[in-house]
């Protein structure tokens, strides 16, 4: 009775992992493991208090993970990187907005390369590989008082526990600091066979 | 022994729905609830018969939900808003295309701000919050007879039953009315723990 | 008997594919079928060794499916098309990057239409329908030595076994051949009720 009730509460309609539990009948064990191994996800929004100043490609290390729309579960955010805790196939995405208003000052150059790179780093093999890139060259002339441009990228990738996802952009000082503007995330879709 | 071992190896952590049924054996109950609680989704395509004029930001209220690529299940479309019926984490997306041909007449201004905002409204707290935004400032000069621009945004959000998703755009009269061009949607990825 | 029949009809191919197996105890049968019917996906990256020339709209037929980030499971890649093997609702996406450097020579025109079209073809009814489109008109002037632009589209669609997904672009000779730049993919989210 109590065990079944607890199971219904925890398992709910989660996508649960049958494995051992179904075979040997240890339902409580299943329930506990189901809770622990729920599908990982993250939605991280830009923390604009610490954005680099250059116009070159830089790794963005300051992201919120627990305020506003930002959230994380069964993944870890550390040192500016999103760390995978559970092997699987994930859908990764990023939305990056750049903006300039004439009140912010004169642009050093009107010809801009506004880019995003979503990269994967493996601790075992300490090298970084770009999974997705996007962006545009833009001519932001002084004829207009306001300029804006957004990039969206997304793709489906196999990620292993311990691998790290990070985001690099050019012209970081042009980033739009709103949580609805500049963010990236991931959610697990399925296990690796 | 051997059968169980093989099962553990093959089934692994497949995503299944155990719920109450597996515990107390009420399979028909599982079946019914499974049908009722199938993962919600929606893909709504623009209904161009009723697009507002002007260049200001407006909420788009006319969308198809049941013709062509448009479809909806376990969500509701009402009063121009996509209503959540089932708590969960959803992937939301929008694709918005703007276009202008010189045969449509002269633009009021050649400097345009082409934007999309995907917003969430809670009936309990009647305020609107932008989940995602994207777009670009564009210079659509008279030197070219045709202009086109598309925006794509996507992200992973926690939605509660009763919350409403809507789409706002600037320059709605420039929207491309094709179903493959201007649409938004959502699909549930997982339950809330 | 009747209960089992009703169960098979309602649950259909829901996430658990329990059906006969769970009812009559044939666990090994379930395990085998579960393995075979794991959620399909594909992530295909551009094979730039065979990109068409010209500026017109062309179907891209050369994609990698098994090197680098490219992968496929329970779907088929054949004759430049991604073939659906399992009915379901899928999230489809594409990321297309265009670029030009002055060292590549002069562009035939500085006014470009950079577009992507993701299309569905049904073998039963041999006609092609565009599911998603995106892009932009661009003015790539000789004042800048380098130009870049990326498009991202994504959406949720019902696909039947045997249907084919393909990608068309304008100005294929401007495509960025990197695997992180030009790709498309799909993953199954849920069964058809």
């Amino acid at each position: 009775g109590a065990v079944q009730k607890e199971l219904q509460h925890i398992v709910g309609s989660q996508h649960i992992r049958a494995e051992k539990a179904m075979v040997d009948g240890s339902w409580l064990d299943l329930a506990k493991r189901s809770k622990l191994e729920a599908q990982p996800f993250a939605h991280l929004t830009i923390n604009a208090t610490d954005i680099p100043t250059g116009s070159h490609k830089v790794s963005l290390s300051s992201w919120y993970h627990d305020r506003g729309w930002a959230k994380i579960s069964n993944m870890t955010f550390s040192n500016g990187k999103l760390i995978v805790n559970q092997d699987g196939f994930y859908y990764l995405y990023a939305n990056i907005c750049f903006r300039h208003h004439e009140t912010s000052g004169d642009l050093a150059t009107e010809y801009l390369q506004l880019m995003v790179y979503v990269t994967k780093t493996s601790i075992k093999i300490p090298s970084s590989h770009t999974l997705m890139k996007g962006g545009s060259t833009k001519y932001w002339s002084g004829n207009s008082e306001f300029h804006f441009y957004s990039i969206n990228v997304g793709g489906f990738f196999k990620l292993r526990s311990g691998e790290e996802i990070s985001v690099e952009v050019s012209n970081p000082s042009l980033l739009d600091p709103d949580q609805d503007a500049t963010y990236f995330g991931a959610f697990k879709v399925r296990d690796i066979d | 022994g051997a059968v169980q071992k093989e099962l553990q190896h093959i089934v692994g952590s497949q995503h299944i729905r155990a719920e109450k049924a597996m515990v107390d054996g009420s399979w028909l109950d599982l079946a019914k609830r499974s049908k009722l609680e199938a993962q919600p989704f929606a893909h709504l395509t623009i209904n161009a018969t009723d697009i507002p004029t002007g260049s200001h930001k407006v909420s788009l209220s006319s969308w198809y939900h049941d013709r062509g690529w448009a479809k909806i299940s376990n969500m509701t479309f009402s009063n121009g808003k996509l209503i959540v019926n089932q708590d969960g984490f959803y992937y939301l997306y929008a694709n918005i295309c703007f276009r202008h041909h010189e045969t449509s007449g002269d633009l009021a201004t050649e400097y345009l701000q082409l934007m999309v905002y995907v917003t969430k409204t809670s009936i309990k707290i009647p305020s609107s919050h932008t989940l995602m935004k994207g777009g670009s400032t564009k210079y659509w000069s008279g030197n070219s007879e045709f202009h086109f621009y598309s925006i794509n945004v996507g992200g992973f959000f926690k939605l509660r039953s009763g919350e409403e998703i809507s789409v706002e755009v600037s320059n709605p009269s420039l929207l491309d009315p094709d179903q493959d061009a201007t649409y938004f949607g959502a699909f549930k990825v997982r339950d809330i723990d | 008997g009747a209960v089992q029949k009703e169960l098979q009809h309602i649950v259909g191919s829901q996430h658990i594919r329990a059906e006969k197996a769970m009812v009559d105890g044939s666990w090994l049968d379930l395990a085998k079928r579960s393995k075979l019917e794991a959620q399909p996906f594909a992530h295909l990256t551009i094979n730039a060794t065979d990109i068409p020339t010209g500026s017109h709209k062309v179907s891209l037929s050369s994609w990698y499916h098994d090197r680098g980030w490219a992968k496929i499971s329970n779907m088929t890649f054949s004759n430049g098309k991604l073939i659906v093997n399992q009915d379901g609702f899928y999230y489809l996406y594409a990321n297309i990057c265009f670029r030009h450097h002055e060292t590549s020579g002069d562009l035939a025109t500085e006014y470009l239409q950079l577009m992507v079209y993701v299309t569905k073809t049904s073998i039963k009814i041999p006609s092609s329908h565009t599911l998603m489109k995106g892009g932009s008109t661009k003015y790539w002037s000789g004042n800048s030595e380098f130009h870049f632009y990326s498009i991202n589209v994504g959406g949720f669609f019902k696909l039947r076994s045997g249907e084919e997904i393909s990608v068309e672009v304008s100005n294929p000779s401007l495509l960025d051949p990197d695997q992180d730049a030009t790709y498309f993919g799909a993953f199954k989210v849920r069964d058809i009720d």
Partner: antibody, heavy 121, light 107 residues
Framework: QVQLVESGGGVVQPGRSLRLSCAAS????????MHWVRQAPGKGLEWVAV????????YYADSVKGRFTISRDNSKNTLYLQMNSLRAEDTAVYYC????????WGYGMDGWGQGTTVTVS | DIQMTQSPSTLSASVGDRVTITCRAS??????LAWYQQKPGKAPKLLIY???SLESGVPSRFSGSGSGTEFTLTISSLQPDDFATYYC?????????FGQGTKVEIK
């Protein structure tokens, strides 16, 4: 740690040319605009020229316009100042300086070299 | 070109004193003003940018204020290391100019 090392200074006759170099390290050189600033003996600082991070935009003080040319080679992390038609009033210590912001002008110069002396006589 | 006028040219003060240096622009420069410190035989060092933003690593006793045409640099409690020459520098419309400098010396 930003490091800027100027070289190429020396004694030169009026009307002749000189080319100054500034070797940069400790930061991503290609991401920042760079200035040349000079200081005549016992005098204050005088701005000379600036170049954007990509080399596309260059601006000069009126006093050197048409005679001096600023350039950069991002692959070599080096800034240059080509000085032609030198005059006695160009005698100064020449500093290269890094822009605080790579994207915007006006944020100040947050890294300076130790300077190289140019004497025109 | 915009002219920058600093005052005073020389300032005599003691350790612990509160010191204020003024910089006036010949026309409005919004907040596009920086302050530098230079010691004899050394390169200048950035203290303040955008009129009031403290450069990383600079002691908090330094502060800047003002906008438009009137700007001030304040040292709240003068330290032995602060005896030097201070320059303001403006940016406007792709042109940079420095003030003539203010020498802060020991009283």
């Amino acid at each position: 740690q930003v490091q800027l090392v100027e070289s190429g200074g020396g004694v030169v006759q009026p009307g002749r040319s000189l080319r100054l170099s500034c070797a940069a390290s400790g930061f991503t050189f290609g991401g920042y605009g760079m200035h040349w600033v000079r200081q005549a003996p016992g005098k204050g600082l005088e701005w000379v020229a600036v170049i954007s991070y990509d080399g596309n935009n260059k601006y000069y003080a009126d006093s050197v316009k048409g005679r001096f040319t600023i350039s950069r080679d991002n692959s070599k992390n080096t800034l240059y100042l080509q000085m032609n038609s030198l005059r006695a009033e160009d005698t100064a210590v020449y500093y290269c300086a890094k822009c605080l912001s790579g994207t915007y002008w006006g944020y100040g110069m947050d890294g300076w070299g130790q300077g190289t002396t140019v004497t025109v006589s | 070109d915009i002219q920058m006028t600093q005052s005073p040219s020389t300032l005599s003060a003691s350790v612990g004193d509160r010191v204020t240096i003024t910089c006036r622009a010949s026309q409005s420069i919004s907040n596009w003003l920086a302050w530098y410190q230079q010691k004899p035989g050394k390169a200048p060092k950035l203290l303040i940018y955008k009129a009031s933003s403290l450069e990383s690593g600079v002691p908090s006793r330094f502060s800047g204020s003002g906008s438009g045409t009137e700007f001030t640099l304040t040292i709240s409690s003068l330290q032995p290391d602060d005896f030097a020459t201070y320059y303001c520098q403006q940016y406007n419309n792709y042109s940079w100019t420095f003030g003539q400098g203010t020498k802060v010396e020991i009283k």
